[in-house]
């Protein structure tokens, strides 16, 4: 029977800069029941606080609700593992909410084949930003990426859409069924997961010729 091994805070993520969650990996338990607590202070302050919510984020997590999430402030946090034989502490982790944002995937992905009479046909893709993101505040710039491939193909074709929420693709294989997905990322932060795939059948008479 031993004191617990050193835990490690391995990830912190925020869906929208208004709340965030951090997760840790326990070290070895030393063969004894082990309690974990996450403590932190904000840069420029010495008063320590304890994790306000160990439940919402699942096992070995700490969720910071709105009243505990401060923009423009760095959090300095560590996890303490304690059993009957002693304690061990994780390394301190410095967290700035601005840089840990990972949005939910974009919503309402719509894909349509457009075949104007006087121009080349194209695939028109449209989507909406994730619900939790308020773009009106100006705090966020979301960038988008689209990927698509024929249903049976192995390789994805990736297009960067910038800040726009619609996109046109001209070069497609007629008669193929395509999968289309979109994802987003803030200017600082992480790519969201890909949205659920939308399928579109490209007509056989879809021409790629000028």
């Amino acid at each position: 029977q031993l004191p617990p091994g050193k835990p490690e805070i391995f990830k912190c993520r925020s869906p929208n800069k208004e709340t965030f969650t951090c997760w840790w990996r326990p070290g070895t338990d030393g063969g004894l029941p082990t309690n974990y607590s996450l403590t932190y202070h904000r840069e420029g302050e010495t008063l320590m606080h304890e994790c306000p919510d160990y439940i919402t984020g699942g096992p070995n997590s700490c969720h910071f609700g709105k009243q505990y999430t401060s923009m423009w402030r760095t959090y300095i946090m560590m996890v303490n593992a304690t059993n009957q034989m002693g304690s061990s502490f994780s390394d301190e982790l410095y967290v700035d909410v601005t840089y840990i944002v990972q949005p939910d995937p974009p919503l309402e992905l719509a894909v349509e084949v457009k075949q104007p009479e006087d121009r080349k046909p194209y695939l028109w893709i449209k989507w909406s930003p994730p619900t939790l993101i308020d773009l009106k505040t100006g705090w966020f710039t979301l960038l988008y990426e689209i990927r698509l491939k024929p249903e049976k193909a192995a390789e994805w074709e990736i297009h960067f859409a910038g800040q726009q929420t619609e996109f046109k693709i001209l070069s497609l294989h007629p008669g193929q069924k395509y999968l289309v997905q979109v994802r987003c990322k803030p200017d600082h932060g992480y790519w969201s997961a890909w949205s659920p795939a939308t399928f579109i059948q490209i007509p056989s008479d879809f021409t790629m010729n000028d």
Epitope: S37, T46, M48, E50, C51, D53, G65, Q67, S70, N80
Partner: antibody
Framework: EVMLVESGGGLVQPGGSRKLSCAAS????????MNWVRQAPEKGLEWVAY????????YYADTVKGRFTISRDNPKNTLFLQMTSLRSEDTAMYYC???????????WGQGTTLTVSS | DIVMTQSPAIMSASPGEKVTMTCSAS?????MHWYQQKSSTSPKLWIY???KLASGVPGRFSGSGSGNSYSLTTSSMEAEDVATYYC?????????FGGGTKLEIK
């Protein structure tokens, strides 16, 4: 509605002990840091002790360190202050208050009066 | 310890007069908080994070400051403002209050 109701005050002899309680309701008690603040008669406010949401962090004012113990029972939504080796200068109104995020003392109880006298 | 010094200790103002009280901290702070306490009642959170008014606080009140120096102002004194106002720092242990400014009406 957030409510904090203190109890346990009264008259105690110097050197005696007393335990104050604070019953909390109207909010998720286990998510909030809690404090005791006191006010001697005709004097200003003095912070006494702080306990974090899960009791991992505890702070005391130097004036009470080693004599007072703050604790909490989250399932019962109750905050405690165990006071020992009481002195006449501990005579005060004792308030239970909470930390709302980083906003200290957004709610206060009505207070309970402790008198230390022979 | 961070020592908080409030001035003046007592002040008197006529109705409608602008009133400013100050709080000086012995160390630089990021935020200051203020509490109002009327006679024989529990204190109330009045201003938090230096300049944000707590719920129910009249708009004639304001807070400002940075570093070591902070102030609470009421733009137009009213009878209901008669109270003692305490500044407070919650950034570092031990948590400390100022000695209070008692605001009276002429």
């Amino acid at each position: 509605e957030v409510m904090l109701v203190e109890s346990g005050g009264g008259l105690v002899q110097p050197g005696g002990s007393r335990k104050l309680s604070c019953a909390a309701s109207g909010f998720t008690f286990s998510s909030f840091g809690m404090n005791w603040v006191r006010q001697a008669p005709e004097k200003g406010l003095e912070w006494v002790a702080y306990i974090s949401s899960g009791s991992s962090i505890i702070y005391y004012a130097d004036t009470v360190k080693g004599r007072f113990t703050i604790s909490r029972d989250n399932p019962k939504n109750t905050l405690f202050l165990q006071m020992t080796s009481l002195r006449s200068e501990d005579t005060a109104m004792y308030y239970c208050t909470r930390f709302y995020g980083y906003i200290p003392f957004d709610y206060w109880g009505q207070g309970t009066t402790l008198t230390v006298s022979s | 310890d961070i020592v908080m010094t409030q001035s003046p200790a007592i002040m008197s103002a006529s109705p409608g007069e602008k009133v400013t009280m100050t709080c000086s901290a012995s160390s630089s702070l990021i935020y200051m908080h203020w509490y109002q306490q009327k006679s024989s009642t529990s204190p109330k959170l009045w201003i938090y994070d230096t300049s944000k008014l707590a719920s129910g606080v009249p708009g004639r009140f304001s807070g400002s400051g940075s570093g070591n120096s902070y102030s609470l102002t009421t733009s137009s004194m009213e009878a209901e403002d008669v109270a003692t106002y305490y500044c407070f720092q919650g950034s570092g242990y031990p948590l400390t209050f100022g000695g209070g400014t008692k605001l009276e009406i002429k």
